[in-house]
């Protein structure tokens, strides 16, 4: 007839795909089973190994991330229960949709994490790593995206995503993105026969430089770059009475925005 065990938990730890549990038998040798289960798995026997005279262990691999596993050390009908949760995993892919980026918004997307996730934390940081915005999104198979609004044009941002499952959080993965700089406002033209004086006022947000281009039938005939503080630029050596396409391009954070205008030099 088997003896009833008296046991105490020695150690337990979990990673994203594995758990380890160790326990001690107090008193005389006895018979026991270590059983583990999850809400989707059913019950199974945990293969037990002996560490020393009184200590036993079980290591399980290839488990589902972010999942709660119940361990029951049972002897006859006497049991100790240990609840362990594997660490959730962050999304495998996380990025910014460039085609959905505007001057004041960034759209991020991700693929669902493998394993169990209850929510995702998405946080937005500026270039100085100051947190600007953060949001917690409930896990959904159909909705793995988010748009940050009210941002500063022409700025670089870092975005972090963290998967949350129960009381555990995954490590964070990062991506970066930039808002489109604002175009210039109020382009003014002062025309002469051989020159054009261009003036403008700044749009909102950050600017690194302005690039001005004068095109003739799609061919660049004159161009120049000025710093972010400039509000005017002059083109010289132009043909009198000629129609040009003027583009004033704003550049910041690796992106560009522009305004264009048809301008004609004064006739002779």
């Amino acid at each position: 007839e088997p003896e009833r065990c008296n046991f105490t938990l020695a150690e337990s730890k979990a990673s994203s795909h594995s758990v380890s549990i160790q326990w001690r038998i107090l008193g005389s040798p006895c018979n026991f089973s270590l059983i583990y289960s999850s809400d989707t798995l059913g019950a199974a026997l945990c293969p037990t190994f002996r560490i020393d005279n009184t200590t036993y262990g079980c290591n399980l691999q290839d488990l589902q991330a972010g999942t709660i596993y119940n361990f029951r050390i049972i002897s006859l009908d006497e049991e100790r229960t240990v609840v362990l949760q594997t660490d959730p995993l962050p999304p495998a892919r996380f990025g910014v949709s460039k085609e959905k980026t505007t001057s004041t918004s960034l759209h991020v997307w991700w693929t669902p994490s493998s394993g169990k996730v209850t929510s995702y934390e998405v946080q937005l940081f500026d270039e100085n790593n100051q947190k600007i915005q953060g949001v917690q999104i409930q896990e959904s198979t159909s909705w793995n995206e988010y748009t940050f609004f009210n941002l500063t044009a022409g700025s670089k941002y870092n975005i972090a995503i963290t998967a949350v499952s129960g009381g555990k959080r995954s490590f964070s993965v990062y991506t970066n993105g930039s808002t489109v700089p604002s175009p210039v406002k109020d382009i003014g033209i002062s025309t002469k026969a051989n020159s054009l004086l261009i003036s403008w006022s700044h749009g909102s947000g950050n600017v690194e430089r302005y690039r001005l281009m004068l095109m003739d039938k799609g061919i660049l005939v004159h161009g120049g770059v000025v710093d972010k503080h400039a509000t005017s630029y002059a083109f010289h050596g132009l043909t009198p009475g000629y129609l040009y396409n003027l583009t004033v391009m704003t550049e910041a954070a690796g992106l560009q925005n522009y305004r264009w205008k048809l301008v004609r030099t004064a006739p002779m």
């Epitope: 007839e1 018979n31 026991f32 089973s33 989707t40 199974a44 026997l45 037990t48 009908d77």
Partner: antibody, heavy 122, light 107 residues
Amino acid sequence: EVQLVESGGGLVQPGRSLRLSCTASGFTFNANAMNWVRQAPGKGLEWVGRIRTKSNNYATYYAGSVKDRFTISRDDSKNIAYLQMNSLKTEDTAVYYCVRDYYGSSAWITYWGQGTLVTVSS
Amino acid sequence: DIQMTQSPFSLSASVGDRVTITCKASQHVGTAVAWYQQKPGKAPKLLIYWASTRHTGVPSRFSGSGSGTDFTLTISSLQPEDFATYFCQQYSSYPFTFGGGTKLEIK
């Protein structure tokens, strides 16, 4: 030697009550969970319910077909498990087995009694 | 409740044959499955537990396999004393449930 002896079976009218007993010997009764399983004549096995030990607060579990009608209890001082059957129906006619189950060395073992026949008929 | 669907319902075989009985759980039960043999007028006898572990004294011709939802009991070479009814049972979660049984008859 492990022994489980069921008693209390017999003929009973529908709507009446009956109490079955399972007297255990040959093992530490108070350390083991006890089950009742039944088998209608010519049919398969149906798990009726289970009672756990004192350290598990004598927790009980039942099959849906008997919930709220049947009650399992135990008297550890006498080594007896009971099955109280109320509001009996003709479909409760069966041989009722008392079953001990226990977790041993990476094992789940069951021991069965020889059963007692309950006939529900008017 | 977890349903245990056992097949076939009955099976005719000869001494020396290899026989396979299957049990399908309606949801994951891990490996918490037992197999029993029952002869007429007798209580069931435990053959296999944890899906694949033979109980003490059970001949090696009996073997169990499976995990999750699909389980199999195999008798490698039928002996005259093996003609009986076989049941599977899940003990992963309450209520514990049995399969409907497979009657193994002499051909």
